[in-house]
Amino acid sequence: MAVTACQGLGFVVSLIGIAGIIAATCMDQWSTQDLYNNPVTAVFNYQGLWRSCVRESSGFTECRGYFTLLGLPAMLQAVRALMIVGIVLGAIGLLVSIFALKCIRIGSMEDSAKANMTLTSGIMFIVSGLCAIAGVSVFANMLVTNFWMSTANMYTGMGGMVQTVQTRYTFGAALFVGWVAGGLTLIGGVMMCIACRGLAPEETNYKAVSYHASGHSVAYKPGGFKASTGFGSNTKNKKIYDGGARTEDEVQSYPSKHDYV
């Protein structure tokens, strides 16, 4: 029972995590314009992995896709790759884990096969989570580096007379979604691996015992029976949770307004 619960919970947590990784990958707010200690601009810039957007105080938002592959920074390409690998591995892991679930019966699938599939999906979830965490962390590191570089020359003077507003970028919502989602996928993967141990069938070998009936010399040798650890025993109705996590990709047409100070 505990094994089923652990496996089911691992699946649901991973499902939510992977949905989060997909959401983070698609979100536009990986980096957002830093408003602290900056003139209050009537435009708000934010960038994602696939496009950059500008939200004007008029309420209009204009987004432009990165219509180039070669012209993009290598780090951005690496982050994209990590996130996509995470999603692909997570998706395969989900597919495998559906068939590995104890509460789902498929033909005459052996417990050992279910255990192997549970372990496989668990490892996939762990790698998927690590990919997402790594991708988000690489992007965050890139932001921190650029932030301090732009802070060093925040205002570039033109003979000390004209000031140029240097747009600095800080962590966007997608980074936090990515970290949390990656962590959930990782936890889900660990739970699946733990569940796998409980699912693994144990070989129960009974030693041959000789029974001597009076007057007869017949030896009965019972064959080695495999302990059927709960296969098909759980006939209760079980709910399979469809943990589809919906995340809203911040397309509000107006920035959170603060009075100009």
């Epitope: 314009q33 003139p39 209050v40 601009t41 009537a42 435009v43 810039n45 960038q47 950059s52 957007c53 500008v54 004007e56 105080s57 008029s58 309420g59 209009f60 204009e62 432009r64 004209v162 000031q163 140029t164 507003v165 747009t167 047409s253 107006y254 959170s256 307004k257 009075d259 100009y260």
Partner: antibody
Framework: EVQLQQSGPELVKPGASVKIACKAS????????MDWVKQSHGKSLEWIGN????????IYNQKFKGKATLTVDKSSSTAYMVLRSLTSEDNAVYYC???????????WGQGTSITVSS | DIVVTQSPSSLTVTPGEKVTMSCKSS????????????LSWYQQNPGQPPKLLIY???TRQSGVPDRFTGSGSGTDFTLTISSVQAEDLAGYYC?????????FGAGTKLELK
């Protein structure tokens, strides 16, 4: 056709308050924000502030903070500006205007003249 | 606040001639996020509200004759009227659309010679 119809001219006493209305028609009111601009007689234009017609969020020019209050009534597609503690400095024509791309003001009301006199 | 300076304050013209007026801001109005300059130009006739001519420094508002051209980047901007018509005799204002509070220039008045 987009139209911003403002309330008529007002003659008010010093220290009093006045409420200017700006009724929008010809477009979905909540899809656009509303800006307010002051023009003193024979002078240039001054930006007062901006209000989000959907959420009611505001941004004010520091100079007009405490002087002007912007509100909206979505049901009647009307934006309002209340000017308080009026003095002779507030004698001007006040415009409501709809911001468009680039934060530029593409449609303007006809203006409301405020005269402060005892 | 950003200071927007317009020059000249008034300009005497004859119909048909080319007119150029300048607008300078104390800070750059260029947004690196979308590579656009947040400056607009308005025309105002006496007793009338201003009318939008140009936004994003060089994009002509629909319905505005193509004799009106906006140019410039960063802090220096120009409005050019290729061939002035009688109906163009009015006041012209530029506006900083980039940094709050949004500020207007003092204006350039176009008068008949």
């Amino acid at each position: 056709e987009v139209q911003l119809q403002q309330s008529g001219p007002e003659l008010v006493k010093p220290g009093a308050s006045v409420k200017i209305a700006c009724k929008a028609s010809g477009y979905t009111f909540t899809d656009y924000n509303m800006d307010w601009v002051k023009q003193s007689h024979g002078k240039s234009l001054e930006w007062i502030g901006n209000i989000n017609s959907y959420y009611g969020g505001t941004i004010y020019n520091q100079k007009f903070k405490g002087k002007a209050t912007l509100t909206v009534d979505k049901s009647s597609s009307t934006a309002y500006m209340v000017l308080r503690s009026l003095t002779s400095e507030d004698n001007a024509v006040y415009y409501c205007a709809r911001p468009h791309l680039g934060n530029a003001l593409d449609y303007w009301g006809q203006g409301t003249s405020i005269t402060v006199s005892s | 606040d950003i200071v927007v300076t317009q020059s000249p304050s008034s300009l005497t013209v004859t119909p048909g001639e080319k007119v150029t007026m300048s607008c300078k801001s104390s800070q750059s109005l260029f947004n690196s996020g979308n590579q656009k300059n947040y400056l607009s130009w308005y025309q105002q006739n006496p007793g009338q509200p201003p009318k939008l001519l140009i936004y994003w420094a060089s994009t002509r508002q629909s319905g505005v004759p193509d004799r009106f051209t906006g140019s410039g980047s960063g802090t220096d901007f120009t409005l050019t009227i290729s061939s002035v018509q009688a109906e163009d005799l009015a006041g012209y204002y530029c506006q900083n659309d980039y940094i709050f509070p949004l500020t207007f220039g003092a204006g350039t008045k176009l008068e008949l010679k």
